[in-house]
């Protein structure tokens, strides 16, 4: 057993059929010592008296709010949450796999640019009863100060017959270069309660392996003369880093049909600007790379050619 | 990304060619190690990040940008002085700042150069004969290290005389590449900034 | 006492269907993920399929996917598989087991795929 | 087709020590723990050793479990005529969690 919060413990369970539990002795955080009468959540069931109270907790039923009392007056209040270990295995019921970019991907993380700010995300079927709480730092032996903002609900979508919640966080690096190169990743570890149950979910990442421009932005069409061909021109998103000409981006330009079975012309260019031929009713998007550590490209900024 | 690229002229600027073509040639070699090496902790996940040139070098702190130099967090130490007779340096007022930088660069080669060897060596003499070093990348070191033309002892190329142990030196081939991409990087992103400036 | 019992194996033609129960006593069955696992005579034990304990997760061994439903109702303490489109591969003994450290097993039931 | 190999058959005399390998990767047992079935013909799987070196109460103390990196054993010492049975390895890959990875058998004979 250990102590998530003030007033707030977790016990760690071996999850199987018949298993023992855990034995737990609450004690009554008061100076006083006759007396005193405790119950769980709301009921006025008396399950013991003193000022501890030993329980043996197996599942969810020995879990909850017990209150000690003493003459109709709440002494105090110590929360017990479960934390299933299933065959060895931490239980992961509160999170949905994201099984992108691999299976057992509950978090998922983004940054724009090498500030050291990135956002986090994660997604649920359960709507109510659920609360998070979010750590991160640079390492985990000496840990270095990250700091995180609370996870809010960030979108709901209808998957099927399900709904699905996605909830995300925006962190930042205390004290980050973008010129640095890491050498300790980034750990995230995320709380989540629902109910009575305690899960924590964790991801490790550099923050080079996580980035994603934003699109590239200002994207321009201009005719050249007596030709079928155009100048396509854009520029750098605002919120990539500085210098451009250290942090250089590559473009990938696009022109793309009305059908989606029609062929695309692909251009890749380190420049902001690309002549192409444009088609009718057809669409030219750029999108954008770090040009020197491959890690994703951003979303299509896109015009029509018309 | 194996594909047509539309590549800028190098220009002025010779290094910013070959500095190109060596992070080309590591990525190269890292996704072939990865690939070859399936069996060893090998993965940028499961493998410890150690920089060898690290107290020797200061690749980072020299070669920051003048933009980023207000930023604190970038200057830990900046105290490390280099020679600075660098042909790389495309006119004659070339700051110290620079030659320092492109010092720097050029211990940072010579020193992956001499643990490349040294590895390729062990390596010969597996007979599970599983992986070398392409000598591609080899000689394009080389060639980034002519161009910056900077004098400089030569470091022995070190020897062992105990019986390699193969396991080891292919986890400490992968830990090898992954912190020299991140070097290439680095040095590609320099180069490209002392070409636009 | 945990109790699993598993029911519906027999003799069917390939191609065709059988519903595979597995009833469950002794424990509460709504807190406990539960698998399904095969062994064809003289060979070794294969997994077939998990459910969590809510039913809202259902994971497959790849020879099974697309053919094999597992189910449960927690009401009537039941863990079930729907097998469709039999192959004569799929001869085997069928267990039903819990999910945990320690494990309680079924007696097995036997499905026989053969025309 | 099983990515934990185990040998297809061991043998001993009564009283002998004999020792059963099962050898994964760095993403099963590399990462997981591991578990030990004995399965009498006719009879389901049989746990007798979990959370790689841990024995349920009423396994005799003959049966041991180990692991390191990536490989796992089981070690039955003072074998017993009854110990002649099918044995299982079983861990999970950290990507396909929760399915079950079953080594290939062993066939444990003792001999008379």
């Known amino acids: 057993i250990w102590e998530l919060k003030k007033d707030v413990y977790v016990v760690e369970l071996d999850w199987y059929p018949d298993a023992p539990g855990e034995m737990v002795v609450l004690t009554c955080d008061t100076p006083e010592e006759d007396g005193i009468t405790w119950t769980l959540d709301q009921s006025s069931e008396v399950l013991g008296s003193g000022k501890t109270l030993t329980i043996q907790v197996k599942e969810f039923g020995d879990a909850g709010q017990y209150t000690c009392h003493k003459g109709g007056e709440v002494l105090s209040h110590s929360l017990l949450l479960l934390h299933k270990k299933e065959d060895g295995i931490w239980s992961t019921d509160i999170l949905k796999d994201q099984k992108e970019p691999k299976n057992k991907t509950f978090l998922r993380c983004e940054a724009k640019n090498y500030s050291g700010r990135f956002t986090c995300w994660w997604l649920t079927t359960i709507s109510t009863d659920l609360t998070f709480s979010v750590k991160s730092s640079r390492g985990s032996s000496d840990p270095q100060g990250v700091t995180c903002g609370a996870a809010t609900l960030s979108a709901e979508r209808v998957r099927g017959d399900n709904k699905e919640y996605e909830y995300s966080v925006e962190c930042q690096e205390d004290s980050a270069c973008p010129a640095a190169e890491e050498s300790l990743p980034i750990e995230v570890m995320v709380d989540a309660v629902h109910k009575l149950k305690y899960e924590n979910y964790t991801s490790s990442f550099f923050i080079r392996d996580i980035i994603k421009p934003d699109p590239p932005k200002n994207l321009q069409l201009k005719p050249l003369k007596n030709s079928r061909q155009v100048e396509v021109s854009w520029e750098y998103p605002d919120t990539w880093s500085t210098p451009h000409s250290y942090f250089s981006l590559t473009f990938c330009v696009q022109v793309q049909g009305k059908s989606k079975r029609e062929k695309k012309d692909r251009v890749f260019t380190d420049k902001t600007s690309a002549t192409v031929i444009c088609r009718k009713n057809a669409s030219i998007s750029v999108r954008a790379q770090d040009r020197y550590y491959s890690s994703s490209w951003s979303e299509w900024a896109s015009v029509p050619c018309s | 990304r194996n594909l047509p690229v539309a590549t800028p002229d190098p220009g002025m600027f010779p290094c910013l060619h070959h500095s190109q073509n060596l992070l080309r040639a590591v990525s190269n070699m890292l996704q072939k190690a990865r690939q070859t090496l399936e069996f060893y902790p090998c993965t940028s996940e499961e493998i410890d990040h150690e920089d060898i040139t690290k107290d020797k070098t200061s690749t980072v702190e020299a070669c920051l940008p003048l933009e980023l130099t207000k930023n604190e967090s970038c200057l830990n130490s900046r105290e490390t002085s280099f020679i600075t007779n660098g042909s790389c340096l495309a006119s004659r007022k070339t700051s110290f700042m620079m030659a320092l930088c492109l010092s720097s660069i050029y211990e940072d080669l010579k020193m992956y150069q001499v643990e490349f060897k040294t590895m390729n060596a062990k390596l010969l003499m597996d007979p599970k004969r599983q992986i070398f070093l392409d000598q591609n990348m080899l000689a394009v070191i080389d060639e980034l290290m002519q161009a910056l033309n900077f004098n400089s002892e030569t470091v022995p190329q070190k020897s062992s005389l105990e019986e390699p142990d193969f396991y080891k030196t292919k986890i400490k081939l992968c830990i090898l590449l992954h912190a020299f991409r991140i070097r290439a990087v680095t040095i590609d992103r320099v180069m490209s900034y002392l070409n636009a400036s | 006492q945990v109790q699993l019992v598993e029911s519906g194996g027999g003799v069917v033609q390939p191609g065709r269907s059988l519903r595979l129960s597995c009833a469950a006593s002794?424990?509460?069955?709504?807190?406990?993920?539960m698998h399904w696992v095969r062994q064809a005579p003289g060979k070794g034990l294969e997994w077939v399929a998990f459910?969590?304990?809510?039913?809202?997760?259902?994971y497959y061994a790849d020879s099974v996917k697309g053919r094999f439903t597992i189910s449960r109702d927690n009401s009537k303490n039941t863990l079930y598989l729907q097998m469709n489109s039999l192959r004569a591969e799929d001869t085997a003994v069928y267990y039903c087991?819990?999910?945990?450290?320690?494990?309680?097993w079924g007696q097995g039931t036997m499905v026989t795929v053969s025309s | 087709q099983s990515v934990l190999t185990q040998p297809p058959s061991v043998s001993g005399a009564p009283g002998q020590r004999v020792t059963i390998s099962c050898s994964g990767s760095?993403?099963?047992?590399?990462?997981?723990?591991v578990k030990w079935y004995q399965q009498l013909p006719g009879t389901a799987p049989k746990l007798l050793i979990y959370?790689?070196?841990q024995r349920p109460s009423g396994v005799p103390d003959r049966f041991s479990g180990s692991k390191s990196g990536t490989s796992a054993s089981l070690a039955i010492t003072g074998l017993q005529a009854e110990d002649e049975a099918d044995y299982y390895c079983?861990?999970?890959?950290?990507?396909?969690?929760?399915?079950?990875?079953f080594g290939t058998g062993t066939k444990v004979t003792v001999l008379a």
């Open positions: 087991k819990t999910h945990g450290s320690h494990d309680n």
């Open positions: 002794g424990f509460t069955f709504s807190s406990y993920g």
């Open positions: 459910i969590r304990y809510d039913g809202s997760n259902k």
């Open positions: 760095r993403s099963n047992i590399g990462s997981n723990t």
């Open positions: 959370y790689n070196d």
């Open positions: 079983q861990s999970y890959d950290r990507y396909t969690h929760p399915a079950l990875l």
